[in-house]
Amino acid sequence: QPSVSPGEPSPPSIHPAKSELIVRVGNEIRLLCIDPGFVKWTFEILDETNENKQNEWITEKAEATNTGKYTCTNKHGLSSSIYVFVRDPAKLFLVDRSLYGKEDNDTLVRCPLTDPEVTSYSLKGCQGKPLPKDLRFVPDPKAGITIKSVKRAYHRLCLHCSADQEGKSVLSDKFILKVRPAFKAVPVVSVSKASYLLREGEEFTVTCTIKDVSSSVYSTWKRENSQTKLQEKYNSWHHGDFNYERQATLTISSARVNDSGVFMCYANNTFGSANVTTTLEVVDKGFINIFPMINTTVFVNDGENVDLIVEYEAFPKPEHQQWIYMNRTFTDKWEDYPKSENESNIRYVSELHLTRLKGTEGGTYTFLVSNSDVNASIAFNVYVNTKPEILTYDRLVNGMLQCVAAGFPEPTIDWYFCPGTEQRCSASVLPVDVQTLNASGPPFGKLVVQSSIDSSAFKHNGTVECKAYNDVGKTSAYFNFAFKGNNKEQIHPHT
């Protein structure tokens, strides 16, 4: 027993004065604590603790389960201990079969021996299976066998404590090791949708999925730039060893405009943190915004095709779409489709396909769209470019030559005189009068131009050309002159 200098309190003395005692099963354990300030005896083995206030601890018929550490404590809190082994050939090990290990830490297989004189105290795999090659252990007859630096791969490992007793190998009850994983990566977080658009009063619900190796991962929904605690509902699953999933659902039962903002799902473990955000936009009512993909004033050549294309944002989703021309609704020739298949898509495309347009098909084409809250429309003014057509070319009673041409854009009419039989008319003739006849008529379609010249100016035989042209093309008509004496005998118009 330890000795201390006089004046200082000393620990109690135990009789027998040894650190270890071996008792045969059925024999008596008699331990005496010698100390004027004796307080108690304490017995400890595995998770069991017993106390005795008598200074002599007597167990008349010792059993294997009486194996353990007996500690005597005095009033100064000083103590001395003796470890008693109760040797029982039928019960070599005391066991507590609960076995948990933290990854990368040591863990104790609690199988203390009742006989310290056995040999080859070690661990064995169940059913003769070998232990993992890298498993290292340290035996201690009084405590059990410590597995060093537990690996995740040891999870659910089946083990026995083993020792050789009188030349025979004895196995304890089996242990199944459960490994608590260490965090070696940040949690994996994902969100059901990256953005939400709602009308005031609608329910906002968003789910964050957190995946990690263990349920001790921390997660929370936070509102950016706010400390308010948000109401969450959790569901969680253990999908297998080291495969834990939690769903954290955030709900605002009746969203308001001022609930708009960025919400963050944050998760962390001892390794680090991860987050993902979702954006909520709450509007007081629905909307439709239309964006033309081409100019709303369209010029197209006669006989060609044109596609009128709009993109539009609609929330809530569009219910009715139509294309209209001259109060007539198109039943075909158009298509309407979402811009993306994304669940949160609010952008759509509508296309009207106009084919082989005629000059008479210019006009206003209107796209109309509506949802449960609003209507919206956009108009396209379509002008069909047509080559001039000469409608009339006549000699009037007053001696004027008149040419009337129609086309779009507005044709220009030029006059030329060709003396004799020349086909190339180069000498231009200035018109006397030029009028646009339907300038105040409908805004689309062909424009009609009338031009006149005075035929009395021509003194020789020849041909007069009326040439109507615009950006699209040109058309000519001809007048032939023949003189007899001083009289213009004939004027033959031809194209």
């Epitope: 998770d47 263990s214 349920s215 001790s216 921390y218 959790y234 569901n235 699953w237 253990h238 999908h239």
Partner: antibody, heavy 119, light 107 residues
């Protein structure tokens, strides 16, 4: 020795409040998720609530969500259940239980504390 | 939520009998199934976890089997101290749910 000891039960009127405590000993409290499980007289077991070892995350049965709050003080090795807006159907023995290996296996239970909600 | 259905709700047996209690989950819970024993006026006690692993200190006459949705608790030779109510519990997902219980009575 690993032990859980509940306290705080008693008779309370409908709409009233009560706070249950569970004192833990014999293990590293902060390493374990903890739970409350209840048992109405003559009925089966019903899980009520859970809290992770750090106290960071809490989980509730739908029947108590919004009325009950689970919390823990790891420095005091104590688990709590704050029960508000109590109803007659909350009458039960309330047990605290330790989650073993983080997988919601209840390996250690307290002896229970009786909560009676009656006018 | 996962529903747990236990059968029978009660049974009478004699000491030495082999007793089987079944538990069915409303969806697959893999092997995340635990069994508890409860005696009147006492807290429940864990017997078996992960469908078949015997909790430390539980006699080997208790055994568990099954996976997916169907599970069984077997007491190979009923002892006087085994007369009690037995509950199954799924630990696959939160909310955690228990079966309704099976009361084992003396015949």
């Amino acid at each position: 020795e690993v032990q859980l000891l509940e306290s705080g039960g008693g008779l309370v009127q409908p709409g009233g409040s009560l706070r249950l405590s569970c004192a833990a000993s014999g293990f590293t409290f902060s390493d374990y998720s903890m739970n409350w499980v209840r048992q109405a007289p003559g009925k089966g077991l019903e899980w009520v609530s859970a809290i992770t070892g750090s106290g960071g995350n809490t989980f509730y049965a739908d029947s108590v969500k919004g009325r009950f709050t689970i919390s823990r003080d790891n420095s005091k090795n104590t688990l709590y259940l704050q029960m508000n807006s109590l109803r007659a159907e909350d009458t039960a023995v309330y047990y605290c239980a330790r989650s073993n290996y983080e997988q919601d296996v209840f390996d250690i239970w307290g002896q229970g504390t009786l909560v009676t909600v009656s006018s | 939520d996962i529903q747990m259905t236990q059968s029978p709700s009660s049974l009478s047996a004699s000491v030495g009998d082999r007793v089987t209690i079944t538990c069915r989950a409303s969806q697959t819970i893999y092997r995340y199934l635990n069994w508890y024993q409860q005696k009147p006026g006492k807290a429940p006690k864990l017997l078996i976890y992960d469908a078949s692993d015997l909790q430390s200190g539980v006699p080997s006459r208790f055994s568990g089997s099954g996976s997916g949705t169907d599970f069984t608790l077997t007491i190979s030779s009923l002892q006087p101290e085994d007369f009690a109510t037995y509950y199954c519990q799924q630990s696959y997902s939160i909310p955690i749910t228990f079966g309704g219980g099976t009361k084992v009575e003396i015949k």
